[in-house]
C-alpha cells in the first residue's frame, strides 16, 4: 500500500491502492535550498539539477568527519518527497538544488540571502514557468531574511518554508515569520501535531497550514536505491511545495495569493487535536492539513477567503494591533478579540493605499488581536462607511448606500473604556441586510464592496442565555466574509472567522456570573460571486 | 595565509579609496537601526548584512561599501566585503569588528544593519 502521507494528501475521489495524482507538476521548477544532495539516487536522478551554488559555514568541531551520505541526507530526502519517482508528491516536477546547509545541517542567514538572490538572478536571465522555492530551514527572527523573501514573492515566486521544529511560536523564527511565505507545520498519521523528542512542530498565527511531517518515507543518501523515514516541518513543507507545483502546473497563471487561498480551501479542516498547542495559541493556529484539490480545474468560480490574525497588541492602554491582507487580496471585514474582554473594538482604515484592520486595547486589558478577513475578489471596489456614536437609544447604524455596493463586514469601535453592560440589547430592524448596527456609544464601520456578480446575505444565530461560544456558518456555495457580534458589549471577548464559521466568544460565565444581558448573537455575512461562477462555466 | 594576504589587499584598497571623502550623515530624521538574533547561541558576530534603502543602485552599494572600508581603515580596522547584494535587496555583506557598527549605521543610504546568524535544517 502507498505511504500514509501520500494517501493523506490525496482527495477521496483519487484514493486507490496507488497514489495517482491528476498532474505531476511538470511545468514547474522547484528550487531547494538545503544540504548537498545525492543526485544519482534512483528517486531523483534526471529530475534534480545540482546548481553550482554553495554558501555554507564550516562544520563545528575539530574532529568532524565529512561523510558524503550524511552530508546529503536532509536534501536528498526532501528532493525525494517533492518529486521522487516512488514516494514523491509532484512526480513530474523538475528541481534545482542550492547548497546553503553544511554537513551538520547548519547554514547562515547571509548564505540563504545570497541563495535567494541567485534564484532571482537566474529567473531574470532565463525566465521559465512558475517557480516554487522550498526553504526547509529556520533561524531566529530575521528582518533581512523576511525582507528578501518578500521581494522574491513579489517577483512572482512561491516560497514554501518549514514552520520550525522548536514547539514554539513560528513568528519567532525566519523565514517562517515572513507573511509572503507559505509556512507549514507538521502533523502525523493520526493528524496530530508532530512531537520531535522534547520539542515538535511550531504553531501560531504565522503558520499557514500543516502537512504530513512524521515518518515520511523518502530517498536515503545511504545508497542509490535506499529509502528512509524522516520527520520534521521540512518534510511537511516539501509536501506543500509538491502540492503547489501540481496546482501551478495545472493553472500556471495562479498568483501567490490565489495559490495560498486554494491551499487553505482544499485542506482538511478541524482534524488536528488543538489540545497539543499551548492554550493561548490554539485560536491563532490554523486547523488545516494540506491536500490536493479534488480536481485541478474549476475552482476559479469560488469566492476564496482566509482569516489573518495580527500580532498581539501588548497590554498598554493605547496599544493597537494591525492585521493586513496580501497585496492581491481585499479586506472584506475586520474583527477583534481579547482574552480579558477589555478592548475598544476595531476599525478598518487606509494605510499606504490599502485597507488594514486595526484593533484597540482598553485600559486594564491584557491586549488585543485584530482579525482580518482577506478575500480574492477580482475587480472589487471596496470602501468603508462610518457612523459616529449615536445619541439615540436605538444604537448606531450604518449601511451601504452606493448603488451596487453590498455589505461584506461590520466593525465597531468605541472610545469609552467600557460599553455599558446594562444597556438594552440592540435589535436589527428586519429586512435591512445592508446595514451594520451597534451600540449607541460605538462608531460603526461598514465594509461595502462592488464587484461583478457579488451578492451577500446576513445570517444570525442568537443564544438567549450566556454561553462561552456562539457560532453561525455559511451554507454550501457561500463564503464567510464578515463575522461580528450583537450587541457589542463588554462581556463579548470578540469575534473571528474559522473557515466558513463565524465564532463569537464570551467571557466564561462561571467567572462573570449571569448578567441581565447575557444574550449573544453571532452575525455572519455570507457572500458569493455569480460572476466568478459564470466565468468558470464559460471556461469549461 | 591566503586570507591574510586577502585582508592586506583589502586594507590597501581601503586606504587608497579615502578620496571618496567622509561619509555624509544620513538624511535628516532617518536613523538606521541595528538588528541581531534574539537567540544568543545562534548569533554570528563579526559578519553583518548592511541593507541599503530600497532604490539604491548597485554602484551606490559598492561605493558605500568602499566608504565603510576607508573609514574603518582610518581607524585602524580591517574589513572585508564578502558580497555585494543586488537583484533582491541592495546592500552588502561585511566582515568587520562590532566596534564599527556605529560608524556603519551613519553611512548614507543605510536602512538597517543585521548581524549574521545561523539557520538550521528542520
Amino acid at each position: 500500500s502507498i505511504p500514509w502521507n501520500l494517501e493523506r494528501i490525496t482527495p477521496p475521489r483519487y484514493r486507490a491502492d496507488e497514489y495517482q495524482p491528476p498532474d505531476g507538476g511538470s511545468l514547474v521548477e522547484v528550487y531547494l535550498l538545503d544540504t548537498s544532495i545525492q543526485s544519482d539516487h534512483r528517486e531523483i536522478e534526471g529530475r534534480v539539477m545540482v546548481t553550482d551554488f554553495e554558501n555554507v559555514p564550516e562544520e563545528d568541531g575539530t574532529r568532524f568527519h565529512r561523510q558524503a551520505s550524511k552530508c546529503d541526507s536532509h536534501g536528498t530526502h526532501l528532493a525525494g518527497v517533492v518529486s521522487g519517482r516512488d514516494a514523491g508528491v509532484a512526480k513530474g516536477a523538475s528541481m534545482r538544488s542550492l547548497r546553503v546547509l553544511n554537513c551538520q545541517g547548519k547554514g547562515t542567514v547571509s548564505g540563504t540571502l545570497i541563495g535567494l538572490e541567485f534564484i532571482r538572478k537566474s529567473q531574470l536571465v532565463q525566465p521559465v514557468g512558475p517557480l516554487v522555492v522550498l526553504l526547509p530551514l529556520a533561524g531566529g527572527y530575521s528582518r533581512v531574511l523576511n525582507a528578501a523573501c518578500q521581494r522574491l514573492a513579489r517577483a512572482g515566486v512561491v516560497l514554501v518554508t518549514a514552520a520550525g521544529n522548536f514547539r514554539d511560536d513560528a513568528c519567532l523564527y525566519s523565514p517562517a515569520s515572513a507573511p509572503e511565505v507559505i509556512t507549514v507545520g507538521a502533523t502525523n498519521a493520526q493528524d496530530q501535531p508532530v512531537t520531535l523528542g522534547t520539542l515538535g512542530t511550531n504553531f501560531g498565527r504565522c503558520v499557514d497550514l500543516f502537512a504530513p511531517g512524521e515518518d515520511i518515507i523518502g530517498a536515503s543518501s545511504d545508497c542509490s536505491t535506499c529509502f528512509v523515514s524522516q520527520s520534521g516541518t521540512s518534510q511537511a513543507a516539501a509536501h506543500v511545495a509538491g502540492i503547489a507545483a501540481m496546482m501551478l502546473s495545472a493553472e500556471p497563471e495562479l498568483t501567490l495569493a490565489e495559490l495560498r487561498q486554494r491551499l487553505i480551501h482544499f485542506s482538511a479542516k478541524d482534524v488536528i487535536n488543538e489540545a497539543w498547542f499551548p492554550e493561548d495559541q490554539r485560536v491563532l493556529t490554523p486547523n488545516l492539513v494540506a491536500a490536493l484539490p479534488p480536481s485541478t480545474h474549476g475552482a476559479g468560480w469560488q469566492l476564496f477567503c482566509r482569516t489573518v490574525w495580527s500580532a498581539h497588541s501588548g497590554p498598554t492602554r493605547m496599544a493597537t494591533a494591525v492585521a493586513r491582507c496580501a497585496p492581491d487580496e481585499e479586506l472584506l471585514s475586520c474583527s477583534s478579540f481579547s482574552r480579558s474582554g477589555k478592548r475598544r473594538g476595531e476599525r478598518m482604515e487606509a494605510q499606504g493605499g490599502k485597507l488594514v484592520c486595526r484593533a484597540h486595547n482598553a485600559f486594564g486589558g491584557e491586549g488585543v488581536y485584530a482579525i482580518a478577513r482577506c478575500c480574492l475578489l477580482p475587480q472589487a471596489n471596496c470602501s468603508v462607511h462610518t457612523a459616529p456614536p449615536a445619541e439615540a437609544s436605538m444604537g448606531t447604524r450604518v449601511h451601504c448606500h452606493q448603488q451596487g455596493h453590498v455589505l461584506t463586514g461590520c466593525s465597531s469601535h468605541w472610545e469609552v473604556e467600557d460599553l455599558g453592560t446594562h444597556k438594552p440589547p440592540v435589535l436589527r430592524p428586519r429586512g435591512q441586510p445592508n446595514q451594520c448596527v451597534g451600540h449607541r456609544e460605538a462608531s460603526i464601520h461598514a465594509s461595502c464592496c462592488h464587484a461583478p456578480g457579488l451578492e451577500c446575505k446576513v445570517k444570525e444565530h442568537g443564544i438567549p442565555a450566556p454561553q462561552e461560544q456562539v457560532t453561525v456558518a455559511c451554507e454550501e456555495g457561500w463564503t464567510l466574509t464578515g463575522c461580528s457580534a450583537l450587541p457589542g458589549t463588554s462581556h463579548v471577548l470578540g469575534a473571528y472567522a474559522v473557515d466558513n464559521t463565524c465564532v463569537v466568544r464570551s467571557r466564561d460565565v462561571s467567572t462573570t456570573g449571569s448578567t441581565s444581558e447575557g444574550a449573544v448573537t453571532a452575525v455572519a455575512i455570507c457572500c458569493r460571486s455569480r460572476h466568478l461562477a459564470q466565468a468558470s462555466q464559460e471556461l469549461q | 595565509q591566503e586570507d591574510e594576504d586577502g585582508d592586506y589587499e583589502e586594507l590597501v584598497l581601503a586606504l587608497r579609496s579615502e578620496e571618496d571623502g567622509l561619509a555624509e550623515a544620513p538624511e535628516h530624521g532617518t536613523t538606521a537601526t541595528f538588528h541581531r538574533c534574539a537567540k544568543d547561541p545562534w548569533r554570528l558576530p563579526g559578519t553583518y548584512v548592511v541593507v541599503l534603502k530600497e532604490e539604491t543602485h548597485l554602484s551606490q552599494s559598492e561605493r558605500t561599501a568602499r566608504r565603510l572600508q576607508a573609514q574603518a581603515a582610518r581607524r585602524g580596522y580591517l574589513t572585508k566585503i564578502l558580497h555585494v547584494f543586488h537583484g533582491l535587496l541592495p546592500g552588502f555583506l561585511v566582515k568587520m569588528s562590532g566596534d564599527l557598527l556605529e560608524l556603519a549605521l551613519k553611512l548614507p543610504h543605510v536602512d538597517y544593519i543585521e548581524e549574521d546568524s545561523s539557520v538550521f535544517a528542520q
Epitope: G46, R85, D86, G92, I217, S220, D222, S224, V228 | -
Partner: antibody
Framework: QVQLVQSGAEVKKPGESLKISCKGS????????ISWVRQMPGKGLEWMGI????????NYSPSFQGQVTISADKSISTAYLQWSSLKASDTAMYYC????????????WGQGTLVTVSS | DIVMTQSPDSLAVSLGERATINCRSS????????????LAWYQQKPGQPPKLLIY???TRESGVPDRFSGSGSGTDFTLTISSLQAEDVAVYYC?????????FGQGTKVEIK
Amino acid sequence: QVQLVQSGAEVKKPGESLKISCKGSGYSFTNYWISWVRQMPGKGLEWMGIIYPGDSYTNYSPSFQGQVTISADKSISTAYLQWSSLKASDTAMYYCARDYYYKPLFDIWGQGTLVTVSS
Amino acid sequence: DIVMTQSPDSLAVSLGERATINCRSSQSVLYSSNNKNYLAWYQQKPGQPPKLLIYWASTRESGVPDRFSGSGSGTDFTLTISSLQAEDVAVYYCQQYSSFPITFGQGTKVEIK
C-alpha cells in the same frame, strides 16, 4: 488482479532485430518500475536494466549497456526490450518484473519470453 | 558492482529436515539510516518465473509459509527452510538491491535426499 503479460516466444536469426513486450494490468503502470532479467539456458538470473514508465528514465547494468534498449509506452501500459542486432548468445528466457513499492526487488513477474537466436 | 556469492551450489535434504543456504555480498548491504539490509531471497521452480520469498533480509513476503526464514546482516546472510517439503524443490537466489546494478547470487539448487 495485478499481472504482467509478456509477448510470445521468438525464433530469430543472428543480425535480426527484435522487440519483446510486457503489458501491466491491475495497477497504475506509470508509478511502478519495470526491470528486465535474463536467464540463459541452465543458468542463473541476470539483471539487465530498469525503466520508470512515468518519465521513461532508465538504468542499465554495465554488462547490457549498449546491447539492448529498454523503453515504455505508458498510454498502453507496456514496457519493451529490444535488440537491433541479435547474436546467438542472446538465446535465453527474458523476464519482466515489477518493483515492490520503493524497493527495487521484484514482487510481480511476467511469465517469461523465450528468445532463440539460431542460424 | 556488488558481487553475491551463494553456498553451496546444490543441497540435498531429507523431507522434514532443515535446509540452510548462505549468501555473501562483496560489500555491506546494511545501511545505518534505517538499519536495514537491502537483501532479498527468491525461489524459482522449473518452468516458472522466480517468486519473492524474503526482503530486508528477514521480512517474509505475504503468503510465504513460515518455514522459510531469513537472517544475517552486513555481508553474511542465510535462508533457512526449517522443515523441507516436496514443493520446496527449486533453485533459490539471493539478490542485493542497495545499488545499481542489481545483482543476484548464482543460485542454490535444493533437492530431496
